[in-house]
């Protein structure tokens, strides 16, 4: 059993989250995750979900009685979602920490907007990746 | 030329974001995007970037002089990042709007945590997807 399970059960007790009323008005995340099967779509959604949990855990870093549980779960999220890749986790954290009301950040964001937009669609792939796709299509066609 | 380009230039003027000092202390997004080539990694990062822009645009929704530009860019983001898929965009917006300090949301999030974690790693794929991977590996090996 993964380490997070026991600790998540501990958090459930703390938040009284096993209570039947918690299920009122549907789910937050599970229903949405069910809608998306494609890996890249799932990553778009999971990215928001993971950042929500990180914010939630940050919000409760006062509460000593759940600190061990929170740390264990965060570590397990790091393993599962970021493949224990510290650079990936750090870049992600950087993105979640930018302040939307900081003028310097606002100006930088607008400055970078055109280039960011140009890279948004999967079609905006590097020449190398486009080429390897073409080769793969060709190979399949000739099988 | 995509419609967003002209409107992004308009925003650059408004924010005085073409000025040389904007480049001080590195980039917000571009440097991070350069680090990740794998599509699913890119989606993790782009998800945070797009939600940042949405929050930024929301922050400036009072400023009439840039409303047309903002709307055009948002629409183009919708096309590029969500493939004009309204359901995808709506699910994404839902996730970005959950409040981390609402007790009901906190309790639901903790209630769903074990199932969310179980789905985080790409390894947690359905049998069907696993099977198709195996077939593909077999086919490549026999070529």
């Amino acid at each position: 059993q993964d380490p997070y399970v026991k600790e998540a059960e501990n958090l459930k007790k703390y938040f009284n989250a096993g209570h039947s009323d918690v299920a009122d008005n549907g789910t937050l995340f599970l229903g949405i995750l069910k809608n998306w099967k494609e890996e890249s779509d799932r990553k778009i959604m999971q990215s928001q979900i993971v950042s929500f949990y990180f914010k939630l855990f940050k919000n409760f870093k006062d509460d000593q009685s759940i600190q061990k549980s929170v740390e264990t779960i965060k570590e397990d999220m790091n393993v599962k979602f970021f493949n224990s890749n510290k650079k990936k986790r750090d870049d992600f954290e950087k993105l979640t920490n930018y302040s939307v009301t900081d003028l310097n950040v606002q100006r930088k964001a607008i400055h970078e907007l055109i280039q960011v937009m140009a890279e948004l669609s999967p079609a905006a792939k590097t020449g190398k990746r486009k080429r390897s796709q073409m080769l793969f299509r060709g190979r399949r066609a000739s099988q | 030329q995509d419609p967003y380009v002209k409107e992004a230039e308009n925003l650059k003027k408004y924010f005085n974001a073409g000025h040389s000092d904007v480049a001080d202390n590195g980039t917000l997004f571009l440097g991070i995007l350069k680090n990740w080539k794998e599509e699913s990694d890119r989606k993790i990062m782009q998800s945070q970037i797009v939600s940042f822009y949405f929050k930024l645009f929301k922050n400036f929704k009072d400023d009439q002089s840039i409303q047309k530009s903002v709307e055009t860019i948002k629409e183009d983001m919708n096309v590029k990042f969500f493939n004009s898929n309204k359901k995808k965009r709506d699910d994404f917006e839902k996730l970005t709007n959950y409040s981390v300090t609402d007790l009901n949301v906190q309790r639901k999030a903790i209630h769903e945590l074990i199932q969310v974690m179980a789905e985080l790693s790409p390894a947690a794929k359905t049998g069907k997807r696993k099977r198709s991977q195996m077939l593909f590996r077999g086919r490549r090996a026999s070529q």
């Epitope: 703390y14 919000n59 870093k61 | -």
Partner: nanobody
Framework: AVQLVESGGGLVQTGDSLRLSCVAS????????MGWFRQAPGKEREFVAR????????SYATSVEGRFAISRDNAKNTVYLQMNSLKPEDTAVYYC?????????????WGQGTQVTVSS
Amino acid sequence: AVQLVESGGGLVQTGDSLRLSCVASGGTFSRYAMGWFRQAPGKEREFVARIGYSGRSISYATSVEGRFAISRDNAKNTVYLQMNSLKPEDTAVYYCASLVSGTLYQADYWGQGTQVTVSS
């Protein structure tokens, strides 16, 4: 034992603001989480907001999220509830409470309450 004294209640119009205060004595204020609860006529006492010992760990009832803000000043042994955009359904007696260590919103000591009335 901890003593808690609330103040700041009153009669206001819909859309107005009020700031409730709660002064604690008889304990180490900075060591425990604090909460606000309310009881409307003929209803059970319900949770409104809570704040951890250092001013983090904040939770709000869904009905007040975005309108009310809880804060604390450990130097003054005081917890506050800033109530904005008040509605008639916010009418209640508001109680301040210290919270049991290791629980999210289980109270151990209560103040005597302060009345808030919102007229339409």
